[in-house]
């Protein structure tokens, strides 16, 4: 089930790469965030809390990522035209309960000016 397109700027371009921003509500304490390209899982990041509120971050499909208190950023490098596609942030919320899943996304357009190694 697709909850809709992201209502924020999901793609931030810099230095021939792109930062894909996956937001989640401040209230969320434990979750898994997956970055999907089409239907394929590219990256994931899981945040859980153990006893004594120790935070654990795990990735099964590792990408360069960055976690903040309300977003996960995934970074893709060396952009080329094959990167153009629909990308989705698939958020599974474990805490607060009950378990919930939301899917938001958008289309990544690749323009010449954003490619990694342009011929001058």
């Amino acid at each position: 089930e697709i909850n809709g397109s992201a209502n924020y700027e999901m793609f931030i371009f810099h230095n021939g790469g792109v930062q894909i921003l996956c937001k989640y509500p401040d209230i969320v304490q434990q979750f898994k965030m997956q970055l999907l390209k089409g239907g394929q899982i590219l990256c994931d990041l899981t945040k859980t809390k153990g006893s004594g509120n120790t935070v654990s971050i795990k990735s099964l499909k590792f990408c360069h990522s960055q976690l903040s208190n309300n977003s996960v950023s995934f970074f893709l490098y060396n952009l080329d035209h094959s990167h153009a596609n629909y990308y989705f942030c698939n958020l599974s919320i474990f805490d607060p309960p009950p378990f919930k899943v939301t899917l938001t996304g958008g289309y990544l357009h690749i323009y010449e000016s954003q490619l990694c190694c342009q011929l001058k």
Epitope: E1, I27, S92, P97, P98, F99, K100, V101
Partner: antibody, heavy 122, light 106 residues
Framework: QVQLVESGGDLVKPGGSLRLSCTAS????????MDWIRQAPGKGLEWVSY????????YYADSVKGRFTISRDNAKNSLFLQMDSLRAEDTAVYYC???????????????WGQGTTVTVSS | DIQMTQSPSTLSASVGDRVTITCRAS??????LAWYQQKPGKAPKLLIY???SLESGAPSRFSGSGSGTQFTLTISSLQPDDFATYYC????????FGQGTKVEIK
């Protein structure tokens, strides 16, 4: 058919204890998160406690935290609520309930038991 | 904690009427809202989930709408079996029920 049957409700004195049980049938109990929800006489519904399918994740309402303990036995298709240090305000019908899920996770409570009555009074 | 406020508390209506019940959340809950029907001495029944999805087996005269903080349950044409109390429930963060709306015969 899908069914939840509660038992264990009784009249108990303040400070006393009670153990509620719920037996599930007609579905794969071990696949579902379960809840206890209560309803005081003539009042609305109040969520009490929640347990994950494997029993490793548990949550309680603030009003019962530290006094009530939820547990389950998947081999016996059973859900339990151990109620200690009971107070007059715990008087209610207690419902065992199944937390429904679908592709987007929870969709609320889709199966309820008939309820069991707990009365706390001296 | 998220508070849920239903209005009206009591609603008098006749068979065939279009009935609307409102539920307001104290903060945004996206679409994580369910509606239940309860008859005296019985357990509640799930009617609507995710704010607007009709539960299997629930009559199609029931519909839900809204997102964020404002939600409505509509009964398009009230039937004799619909006189009952209706509760909204948020499940965005834990679970909170509204205080209920009793639909009675006018």
């Amino acid at each position: 058919q899908v069914q939840l049957v509660e038992s264990g409700g009784d009249l108990v004195k303040p400070g006393g204890s009670l153990r509620l049980s719920c037996t599930a049938s007609g579905f794969t109990f071990s696949d579902y998160y379960m809840d206890w929800i209560r309803q005081a006489p003539g009042k609305g519904l109040e969520w009490v406690s929640y347990i994950s399918s494997s029993g490793d994740t548990i949550y309680y309402a603030d009003s019962v935290k530290g006094r009530f303990t939820i547990s389950r036995d998947n081999a016996k298709n059973s859900l339990f609520l151990q109620m200690d240090s009971l107070r007059a305000e715990d008087t209610a019908v207690y419902y065992c309930a199944r937390d429904a899920h679908y592709v987007s996770g929870s969709k609320g409570v889709d199966v309820w038991g008939q309820g069991t009555t707990v009365t706390v009074s001296s | 904690d998220i508070q849920m406020t239903q209005s009206p508390s009591t609603l008098s209506a006749s068979v065939g009427d279009r009935v609307t019940i409102t539920c307001r959340a104290s903060q945004s809950i996206s679409s994580w809202l369910a509606w239940y029907q309860q008859k005296p001495g019985k357990a509640p029944k799930l009617l609507i989930y995710k704010a607007s999805s009709l539960e299997s087996g629930a009559p199609s005269r029931f519909s839900g709408s809204g997102s964020g903080t404002q939600f409505t349950l509509t009964i398009s044409s009230l039937q004799p079996d619909d006189f009952a109390t209706y509760y909204c429930q948020q499940y965005y963060s834990y679970w909170t029920f509204g205080q209920g709306t009793k639909v009675e015969i006018k």
